[in-house]
Amino acid sequence: SEVEYRAEVGQNAYLPCFYTPAAPGNLVPVCWGKGACPVFECGNVVLRTDERDVNYWTSRYWLNGDFRKGDVSLTIENVTLADSGIYCCRIQIPGIMNDEKFNLKLVIKPAKVTPAPTRQRDFTAAFPRMLTTRGHGPAETQTLGSLPDINLTQISTLANELRDSRLANDLRDSGATIRIG
């Protein structure tokens, strides 16, 4: 089953995905695709990184986090109902069938109608790109810092445990990662 994340129409959606690069200067390629992870690669690729850069992206999809330190979480800007569905984060570890695949389910809800503007709404209007749907605040405050690591043998267990978005959010906040190498 997929881990579920929610966002409202018009907001930025945030889909977490992490790994720990094995060595400086030699990042692991990552692809994001719309649709569940296939056997190889990503279907309907929306963003891709290589050993150093974001080398392919489509409109509204970007990496707001510290991707060169392994935070390859996807931000989808100004979401609509059509953005609902499964997204694949694939960490393309060298070697045969070594890739780590994560399916994340994005559920888009209609925007709440509020009767009058509030201070919070004013802040959101002023900084739309700097907010995530889970209220982490400005992007520059989101760092990988000193995060605990999860090794590859724990991944399947982890995937089984991530049944609800509340637990997934807790995991994101505690900063669990995959260590490569």
């Epitope: 080398n55 990496l63 991707f67 520059e140």
Partner: antibody, heavy 120, light 107 residues
């Protein structure tokens, strides 16, 4: 301390090629990317490409594909850039710059620059 | 490729002034922006990396901020030795691109 020592100024004729060097010292050469940047007189900076000395992997700005070739000699910790089919438009100062993982591939050290003049 | 629009082109200053320059990316680059200082006849020097991190040895009067598409570089109290050209650069995706530069000059 980290140093990037570039070769001296070059005066070449249109149509010729030139190969300039960038000798690195004070750090592990294979751990960092080496990028090359062009600065035309009184103008901004243009990224040409990079090479990763560890495996020789390269990436080029589309604009400089076919114009520039990046290579390294690991044994001497030296990066090279060869420019082909030179025209007056290639007259500029060329910098090598170290792209550091710890500075997110911004350039923490730069060479002093090699001035290239293309003139008949 | 991503265009970095840097303003202003020239910035007249007096010693002690607080000055701010901006860089706007044509699309989001996360926090992957650096700021460099270049004095006449010299190579550029890294001042700020990853939008807001001051590089080793850079005085704390230099600060950077921003995320996404809008970035700001500030010198809190300009010193004579700060007279130079300042460039922003995005290193999110190749080809990495630089702003056109902001030249600090005496009023």
């Amino acid at each position: 301390q980290v140093q990037l020592q570039q070769s001296g100024p070059e005066l070449v004729k249109p149509g010729d090629s030139v190969k300039m060097s960038c000798k690195a010292s004070g750090y592990t050469f294979t751990d960092y990317y080496m990028d090359w940047v062009k600065q035309s007189h009184g103008k901004s900076l243009e990224w040409i490409g990079y090479i990763y000395p560890n495996n020789g992997g390269t990436s080029y700005n589309q604009k400089f594909k076919g114009k520039a070739t990046l290579t390294v000699d690991k044994s001497s910790s030296t990066a090279y850039m060869e420019l082909h089919s030179l025209t007056s438009e290639d007259s500029a100062v060329y910098y090598c710059a170290r792209g550091g993982y710890y500075s997110y591939y911004s350039y923490d050290y730069w060479g002093q620059g090699t001035t290239l003049t293309v003139s008949s | 490729s991503i265009v970095m629009t840097q303003t202003p082109k020239f910035l007249p200053v007096s010693a002690g002034d607080r000055v701010t320059m901006t860089c706007k990316a044509s699309q989001s680059v996360g926090n992957n922006v650096a700021w460099y200082q270049q004095k006449p006849g010299q190579s550029p020097k890294l001042l700020i990396y990853y939008a807001s991190n001051r590089y080793t040895g850079v005085p704390d009067r230099f600060t950077g901020s921003g995320s996404g598409t809008d970035f700001t570089f500030t010198i809190s109290s300009v010193q004579v030795e700060d007279l130079a050209v300042y460039f922003c650069q995005q290193h999110y995706s190749s080809p990495y691109t630089f702003g056109t530069g902001t030249k600090l000059e005496i009023k």
